[in-house]
């Protein structure tokens, strides 16, 4: 049902969601640390801009009796619960800051009637995409999907010469939340990945995948796996790989491959790890100091949402337009705007736009080495390392169908 | 503003090496990457390679693969590009140049004022 | 021998419109990959002309332009003034082994 909005009369209300179930096992008072050094930037900025308004974060906390997992799989009902008691208290204000849980936010945008705009830090499962109201500030899943089958199809760089077209995918169902979604989209066989893909099989054992490393009827050369090397260590360990085997590892939020003097363990050098560029040192900010990597990221993307907002508020007050308007509700797409750690850029539907990293290990120097950059707002690849030190043979990717020709 | 000062003029002997310095003032030095470009006399601009800081390895053109090294200082907000196996043809003026952003694919947009490398016995 | 080719000079009168082409291939201007252009004076370091195929930088006159299409891209001097007398540069990204950056032979600008 409608509610009304605390956003007027030179006062403008975020609400923020604190879920017990979160895509990232994070302290909610780590979450309300980065909202509150947002809304001290946002102050700054639209004092700057002559613009003498309140900006203020009311917490929504919900009561963790019922929904007390901890990830997302009991996060459905309980983003219903937290807007039903927004609806009582008359407690809504201009936006609203989370859910991060795909499940809830998918449940949340169908069961009300969203003339505010909602901002996630997640929900990163096809099922979100193309919400005319919402906003997602962590890279989701299409975004990775788009970037995999450019890089299949490519056949033209020194170091790519086969186009690929099949594929291993290991899903076990003990993923992270941002895992779970990314490689459900490359499961699900309507996804633009299957679709574009001659054949695809998923792994679900640790044994499956562990067969599949030396043997010679395997149909594909080439596994997708999701999540950080120990993991992939867990899995594989010391076990004999054969010279043609490729392993992509998505492990996006994590840029302990950038950190100073790191070397890449020897289970690396099948691999090429896909991973976001990362961003310039927030080691120095009070909200981040006590972060992993992987946190950093999801409380970043909670300080950009309250970015976000000061951005199009500052925009609409300048422009003397109302704030409570579904045009209000639906500006938050298609824009660049001044993020914590430099310009974030938002595609038409909302959904934020990064560069994508591909890494291997140098069999030289034992470092990861960036082998090409992908930008997803333009969807375009550019080869960072033309002569890659790679383990496989004559420093090329192999054919991706062991035996098979040029194509 | 971003400013790029690099190291004074070098006259070098046949097969020995040179460093050329280029220090950065004004901006987040990590954050972008820097190439090396290089004019020989009356001749065009050719890219050597170029580095992106945060990252720490560089990358090379072909022309120049394993006898350029490129290297940067965070510390000092500095990079560095060393030519060895110098020979007569490699008298040029360098330039060191910040991308606009963070790859080299990025444009040129600050460039140092060049530093001349004479090669002559 | 320059992987993105220019003609070597061009000339033109004062208020006159020249352009410069640049001519590449499918795996740099034709593979999507953005073109820039440079300015250089004799015994000065280049300076960013022209960015992303045709957004100027601050501070560059309205004059020059540029365009991409296909395989090839140009720089357009319009009212030519005899102080834009100077070397001009194009650069793009390249997919093959002569990259990833890559120059025009650059070409000559004489204000007759």
């Known amino acids: 049902s409608q509610v009304s909005q605390n956003c007027h009369n030179g006062s403008y209300e975020i609400s923020v969601l604190m879920m017990g179930n979160s895509a990232f096992a994070e302290p909610l008072k780590n979450l309300e640390d980065a909202v509150n050094e947002g809304l001290e930037i946002v102050r700054g900025r639209l004092q700057n801009a002559g613009l003498n308004v309140t900006v203020n974060a009311t917490f929504m906390y919900s009561d963790g009796l019922i929904h007390n997992s901890g990830d997302c799989r009991s996060s459905t009902c309980e983003g219903l619960d937290l807007l039903r008691k927004i609806s009582n208290a008359q407690r809504m204000g201009c936006v609203l800051i989370g859910p991060s849980c795909t499940y809830s936010t998918f449940q949340m945008y169908l069961d009300t009637e969203l003339s505010y705009p909602m901002i996630s830090a997640g929900s990163f499962g096809l099922s979100c995409d193309y919400k005319e109201t919402l906003t997602r500030l962590m890279s989701p899943a299409r975004k990775l999907m788009y970037f995999l089958v450019n890089f299949w199809k490519t056949n033209d760089l020194p170091f790519k010469t086969y186009s690929w077209s099949t594929s291993y995918v290991y899903k076990n169902g003990t993923e992270t939340e941002d895992c779970f979604w990314y490689l459900n989209a490359l499961e699900a066989s309507v996804s633009y990945f299957s679709h574009e893909l001659g054949f695809k099989v998923v792994l679900r054992q640790d044994k499956e995948f562990q067969d599949i490393l030396m043997d010679h009827n395997r149909k594909s050369n080439v596994i997708i796996m999701c999540g950080g090397p120990e993991f992939l260590y867990k899995l594989k360990g010391d076990r004999a790989v054969a010279e043609d085997i490729v392993i992509i590892l998505v492990d996006l939020f994590n840029d302990q491959y950038f950190e100073d003097n790191v070397t890449a363990p020897d289970y690396m050098k099948n691999v090429l790890v896909l991973t976001l560029s990362p961003g310039n040192s927030l080691l120095n900010s009070s909200f981040s100091r006590n972060l992993s990597p992987t946190k950093r990221d999801f409380a970043l993307a909670y300080l950009n949402g309250i970015l976000l907002f000061g951005h199009m508020l500052k925009i609409f007050l300048e422009n003397g337009e109302n704030i409570t308007t579904p045009k209000f509700a639906h500006a938050f797409r298609n824009l660049t705007f001044e993020g914590y750690d430099g310009p974030v850029t938002l595609d038409d539907w909302g959904d934020v736009d990064s560069t994508m990293v591909l890494l291997y290990t140098s069999v030289d120097t034992k470092k990861y080495k960036v082998l090409l950059t992908y930008d997803t707002h333009v969807n375009k690849t550019y080869p960072v390392d033309m002569s890659p030190t790679f383990t496989w043979k004559n420093s090329k990717l192999p054919n991706d169908i062991t035996g098979r020709g040029p194509q | 503003e971003v400013q790029l000062v690099q190291s004074g003029a070098e006259v070098k002997k046949p097969g020995s090496s040179v460093r050329v310095s280029c220090k950065a003032s004004?901006?987040?030095?990590?954050?972008?990457?820097i190439s090396w470009v290089r004019q020989a006399p009356g001749q065009g601009l050719e890219w050597m390679g170029g580095?992106?800081?945060?990252?720490?390895?560089?990358n090379y053109a072909q022309k120049f693969q394993g006898r350029v090294t490129i290297t940067a200082d965070k510390s000092t907000s500095t990079a560095y590009m060393e030519l060895s196996s110098l020979r007569s043809e490699d008298t040029a003026v360098y330039y060191c140049?910040?991308?606009?952003?963070?790859?080299?694919?990025?444009?040129?947009?600050?460039w140092g004022q060049g530093t001349t490398v004479t090669v002559s016995s | 021998q320059s992987v993105l080719t220019q003609p070597p000079s061009v000339s033109g009168a004062p208020g006159q419109r020249v352009t410069i082409s640049c001519t590449g291939s499918s795996s740099n201007i034709g593979a999507g990959y953005d073109v820039h252009w440079y300015q250089q004076f004799p015994g000065t370091a280049p300076k960013l002309l022209i960015f992303g195929n045709n957004n100027r930088p601050s501070g560059v006159p309205d004059r020059f332009s540029g365009s991409k299409s296909g395989t090839s891209a140009s720089l357009a001097i319009t009212g030519l003034q005899a102080e834009d007398e100077a070397n001009y540069y194009c650069q793009s990204y390249d997919r093959s082994l002569s990259g990833p950056v890559v120059f025009g032979g650059g070409t000559k600008l004489t204000v007759l």
């Open positions: 004004g901006g987040t030095f990590s954050s972008y990457a």
């Open positions: 140049a910040r991308g606009g952003g963070r790859w080299l694919h990025s444009r040129l947009d600050v």
């Open positions: 580095i992106i800081p945060i990252f720490g390895t560089a």
